[in-house]
C-alpha cells in the first residue's frame, strides 16, 4: 500500500433492479483488477419528494474524480441521480449530498441502505 | 497480449441458427463480463447482449430477446452466441467484447469482428 | 431503454482543430458513460470511460465531461489518426445502448 492511501478491497453492494437483473440485492463486493490501478465505491441514488431511494452500490473502477476521498459526497446541484465516489473498505456504506452551490449552510444526509 | 478471436459468421437463410463463439486468451477470462456488440453495415453500434462472469446473469436488447442466447465457458476461455430465427436485420458485423466487473463497465477489449449475413 | 443522440452526426475539421462531440440521455445516467473510436474495417477502441477517465494509452488529447444527461468529447487538437466515428455508451442501466455516432471527416 502507498502511503497516505485507503486501498479499497471490498465495497458495499446494492442493486435496486435485482430481481431483473438476477443478482443479490445487498451484500459485499470485492474489488479486484490491474494492480496499477486504484478501485474505489460509489454510490447512486434519487431523492424522491424527500425519500432517498438507494439504485446502485459497488466497486468503481479507477477514477480520478474519487482518488483521495475517504467520505461519500455528492457535490452536484440537485441532480436527477446522485452519484458518489471514495476510497476505502466499504466507504460506501454512507454517503452524503453537499451542494458546492449553495448559498446557505448545506445539510448533510447520510444513508444507511435498510436490510432487504 | 490480451485478445479476443470471434468465429462461427457466415451466410445463413432467414429463419436459420448460428452460433458465434469468441476465444479469449492473455487475461483471466472468468474475472470479465462479455459482451456482443454488432454493427449493420454502414450502420451504427448496436449493444447485443452481456453476461456477468459466472454467467449468472444474462442481459438482452429487445430486438434480438427471446431469439439469442448468451453463455460462456470459463473452462475454455470462451464465449457464446446462440441466434436462432435469424432475420434479415441481423446481417451485421458481431464483435465480442470484454468489460471489467466493476462499474461502470465499458468495453475494454474487442475482437475483430465475425460477419454475420441472413439472405435467402 | 435508454436513447443516447449524439450531435453532430458527422463534421468537417482540419488537422489542428478543437473539436467537440455531444451525447445526450434520454435520462440521467449518472458518469455511467463511454466513449469510443471506431476507424473503416477497424473494431472500436475505448477512449474515455466514466464519463471524463482517460483510458490507458489514449493521447492526453482526448478529453471527456459531463454527468446525468449532457455529456462532452473534446480533442484539442485533431490529429490525422484521429479521422474516425466516435460513438456514446451508457451503462447505467443493464440495457446498453449506444449513440448515434459522429463522423469526422478532413475539410
Known amino acids: 500500500a502507498i502511503l497516505g492511501r485507503s486501498e479499497t478491497q471490498e465495497c458495499l453492494f446494492f442493486n435496486a433492479n435485482w430481481e431483473k437483473d438476477r443478482t443479490n440485492q445487498t451484500g459485499v463486493e470485492p474489488c479486484y483488477g490491474d494492480k496499477d490501478k486504484r478501485r474505489h465505491c460509489f454510490a447512486t441514488w434519487k431523492n424522491i419528494s424527500g425519500s432517498i431511494e438507494i439504485v446502485k452500490q459497488g466497486c468503481w473502477l479507477d477514477d480520478i474524480n474519487c482518488y483521495d476521498r475517504t467520505d461519500c459526497v455528492e457535490k452536484k446541484d440537485s441532480p436527477e441521480v446522485y452519484f458518489c465516489c471514495c476510497e476505502g473498505n466499504m466507504c460506501n456504506e454512507k454517503f452524503s449530498y453537499f451542494p458546492e452551490m449553495e448559498v446557505t449552510q448545506p445539510t448533510s444526509n447520510p444513508v444507511t441502505p435498510k436490510p432487504p | 497480449e490480451v485478445q479476443l478471436l470471434e468465429s462461427g459468421g457466415g451466410l445463413v437463410q432467414p429463419g436459420g441458427s448460428l452460433r458465434l463463439s469468441c476465444a479469449a486468451s492473455?487475461?483471466?477470462?472468468?474475472?470479465?463480463?462479455m459482451g456482443w456488440v454488432r454493427q449493420a453495415p454502414g450502420k451504427g453500434l448496436e449493444w447485443v447482449s452481456s453476461?456477468?462472469?459466472?454467467?449468472?446473469?444474462?442481459y438482452y436488447a429487445d430486438s434480438v430477446k427471446g431469439r439469442f442466447t448468451i453463455s460462456r465457458d470459463n473452462s475454455k476461455n470462451t464465449l457464446y452466441l446462440q441466434m436462432n430465427s435469424l432475420r434479415a436485420e441481423d446481417t451485421a458485423v458481431y464483435y465480442c467484447?470484454?468489460?471489467?466487473?466493476?462499474?461502470?463497465?465499458?468495453?475494454?477489449?474487442w475482437g475483430q469482428g465475425t460477419l454475420v449475413t441472413v439472405s435467402s | 431503454d435508454i436513447q443516447m443522440t449524439q450531435s453532430p452526426s458527422s463534421l468537417s475539421a482540419s488537422v489542428g482543430d478543437r473539436v467537440t462531440i455531444t451525447c445526450r440521455a434520454s435520462?440521467?445516467?449518472?458518469?455511467?458513460l463511454n466513449w469510443y473510436q471506431q476507424k473503416p474495417g477497424k473494431a472500436p477502441k475505448l477512449l474515455i470511460y466514466?464519463?471524463?477517465n482517460l483510458q490507458s494509452g489514449v493521447p492526453s488529447r482526448f478529453s471527456g465531461s459531463g454527468s446525468g444527461t449532457d455529456f462532452t468529447l473534446t480533442i484539442s487538437s485533431l490529429q490525422p489518426e484521429d479521422f474516425a466515428t466516435y460513438y456514446c455508451?451508457?451503462?447505467?442501466?443493464?440495457?446498453?445502448?449506444f449513440g448515434g455516432g459522429t463522423k469526422v471527416e478532413i475539410k
Open positions: 466514466a464519463a471524463s
Open positions: 435520462q440521467s445516467v449518472s458518469r455511467f
Open positions: 453476461i456477468s462472469t459466472s454467467g449468472g446473469s444474462t
Open positions: 467484447a470484454r468489460s471489467p466487473a466493476h462499474s461502470p463497465h465499458p468495453f475494454d477489449i
Open positions: 455508451q451508457q451503462s447505467y442501466s443493464s440495457l446498453f445502448t
Open positions: 492473455g487475461f483471466a477470462f472468468s474475472s470479465y463480463a
